[in-house]
């Protein structure tokens, strides 16, 4: 058992040009605090995932109101330390996240509003019992100086936390076979009581006559390594030379996690997904109330009014996750038409729209013919965003204002002969054929296949069709 | 205003089925886009192009299916997966007018699948 302490130093705009802007201002002064969350191992998961070794919240920092015109100092920050406790073994590998909240005090309805500021995250080696570790980490142009650390809490000692100590019995030496416990010369490590033979290096116990394995580890003393190599079966066969697991009780057998969590065999050892209100490995860990504020992006904090009851985060629209800590992206569902950009602003959800299209959705077609006029005579028609040109006879091109040849696709039928003419063109037909394009055959009684005449024209009459 | 009705969720073995359904009513002019979620994440819904877009960890096991006429998405669930227990909300982009649109969330239905 330990506690992972985390001492922020600072946090405010970062070296180098594009200084953020103040998250205060005098109409909306705020403040900030910070949240912790650790996981085991140097997994590099999402920032939803859940904080395995623990999470913290740290106190609200002063009020700060920007001063204006001044460039944005260091922020004024929480007292003290964060503290996330653990119970077993420290693993000596970590992964961290680091979130900087903003509370806004104006005078919102209902309550303050919280946002997320910045998030750092980061994988470390960490040895228990070892001095503050300093760190930079810049998110944007903000930059943030902590320093954290790993003690154990006694009896327990070592690296991991595993080894235990008790005060002497005699005031001179240790008894047989126990070492002093550096640096507490004063105390003795505590007499060997975990199962006979269990590995000290990838063994640790609580109770006594019991062997748990550190991550990586199996076996009922903790001596095989966890492999990926094939195996014969889930387990692997029972050799400890392969480096499979051995035959026998899986992680999950007897279900290792706690207050109601469920267990999931992972390749190197087990999770716990754990109940609002629980944390930890094992889901040992709880005392997360509703006054530590855990519920973010301005969700409601119900029960949880003491350390054994747990407390439930009503989300608001938008938001999901155990502490309302993930936004949903409803650009997903694209909801923008037409090949419009999506953005997902948090308050609202907008659509940029590509040329030719507007409205919130990019649903509206625009009339691109406003003042393009097609030349010649041509008349402008809407569609697909883009406006084309129906030409007037004799032009053709994008805005009429080639001169189009009328003849180019031989409209005259029969062997007629095509001539350009300036309102269009005309055909002069073949022995045996009339019409504006020579498509009537001339019948030899002198009637044709015209259709019936206009008033005041016999069939067979010279006609020019234009 | 409009509101989303969510039914149809409950306990099932793994392996079985669940069918999910969210009505919308209101002042509504037209459906934009309407889909289930959980845990933040598209499970499957319609988009405003009207395709069909689904998660990659449901496909062939979820079908989604819209009743324009009573402004309906189905989310028909088959061989339901432990890992697939969540609350799943309903969410819609809904025009009330020609020119106003804005995005609406059901209260969300549990799904326990054991």
């Known amino acids: 058992a330990g506690v992972f302490e985390l001492q922020i130093h600072s946090f405010g705009p970062g070296p180098g040009p594009g200084a953020p802007r103040s998250p205060c201002s005098a109409r909306l002064p705020c403040r900030l605090f910070f949240r912790v969350c650790l996981k085991p191992g140097l997994s590099e998961e999402a920032a939803e995932s859940p904080c395995a070794l623990g999470a913290a919240l740290s106190a609200r920092g002063p009020v700060y109101t920007e001063q204006p015109g001044a460039p944005a100092p260091d922020l004024p920050l929480p007292d003290g330390l964060l503290q996330v406790p653990f119970r077993d073994a420290w693993p000596g590998t970590f992964s961290f996240i680091i979130e900087t909240w903003r509370e806004e005090l104006g005078d919102q309805i209902g309550g303050p509003a919280w946002s997320l500021l910045a998030r750092v995250a980061g994988r470390r080696r960490l040895a228990a019992g070892g001095p503050w570790a300093r760190d930079i980490q810049r998110a944007g142009a903000w930059e943030l100086r902590f320093s954290y650390r790993a003690r154990c809490e006694p009896p327990a000692v070592g690296t991991a936390c595993t080894r235990l100590c008790r005060p002497r019995s005699a005031p001179s030496r240790c008894g047989p076979g126990l070492r002093p416990c550096a640096p507490l010369e004063d105390e003795c490590e505590a007499p060997l009581v975990c199962r006979a033979g269990c590995s000290p290096e990838h063994g640790f116990c609580e109770q006594p006559g019991e062997c748990r394995c550190l991550e990586g580890w199996t076996g009922p003393l903790c001596t095989v390594p966890v492999s990926t190599s094939s195996c014969l079966s889930p387990r692997g066969p029972s050799s400890a030379t392969t480096g499979c697991l051995v035959p026998g009780p899986g992680p999950c057998d007897g279900n290792p996690c706690a207050n109601g969590g469920s267990c999931s065999e992972t390749p190197r050892s087990f999770e716990c997904t754990c109940p609002r209100g629980f944390y930890g490995l094992r889901c040992e860990v709880s005392g997360v109330t509703c006054a530590d504020g855990p519920c973010f992006n301005g969700g409601l904090c119900v029960g949880g009014a003491d350390p054994d009851s747990a407390y439930i985060c009503h989300c608001p629209p938008g938001f999901q996750g155990s502490n309302c800590e993930k936004r949903v992206d409803r650009c997903s569902l694209q909801p923008c038409r037409n090949g419009g950009l999506c953005l997902d602003l948090g308050h609202a959800l907008r659509c940029r729209c590509r040329a030719g299209f507007a409205g919130p959705r990019c649903e509206h077609d625009l009339d691109d013919c406003a003042g393009r006029a097609c030349a010649n005579g041509g008349t402008c028609v809407e569609g697909g965003g883009a406006h084309r040109c129906s030409c007037a006879l004799g032009f053709g091109g994008r805005d009429c204002r080639e001169r189009a040849d009328p003849c180019a696709a031989r409209p005259c039928a029969h062997g007629g002969r095509c001539y350009a003419h300036f309102s269009g063109l005309v055909c002069a037909c073949a022995p045996g054929y009339m019409g504006a394009r020579c498509e009537f055959p001339v019948h030899p009684d002198g009637a044709s296949a015209l259709p019936a005449a206009p008033p005041g024209l016999r069939p067979g009459d010279p006609q020019r069709y234009l | 205003q409009v509101q989303l009705q969510e039914s149809g969720g409950g306990l099932v073995q793994a392996g079985g089925s669940l069918t999910l359904s969210c009505a919308a009513s209101?002042?509504?002019?037209?459906?934009?886009?309407m889909g289930w979620y959980r845990q933040g994440d598209l499970v499957a819904g319609f988009t405003s192009e009207g395709?069909?877009k689904y998660a990659d960890s449901v496909k062939g096991r979820f079908t989604i299916s819209r009743d324009d006429a009573k402004n309906m998405v189905t989310l028909q669930m088959n061989s339901l997966k432990p890992e697939d227990t969540a609350v799943y909300y309903c969410?819609?982009?809904?025009?009330?007018?020609?020119?106003?649109?804005?995005?609406?969330w059901g209260q969300g239905t549990l799904v326990t699948v054991k």
């Open positions: 969410a819609a982009d809904i025009f009330s007018d020609r020119d106003h649109v804005d995005w609406y």
């Open positions: 209101g002042s509504i002019f037209s459906i934009n886009a």
């Open positions: 395709s069909a």
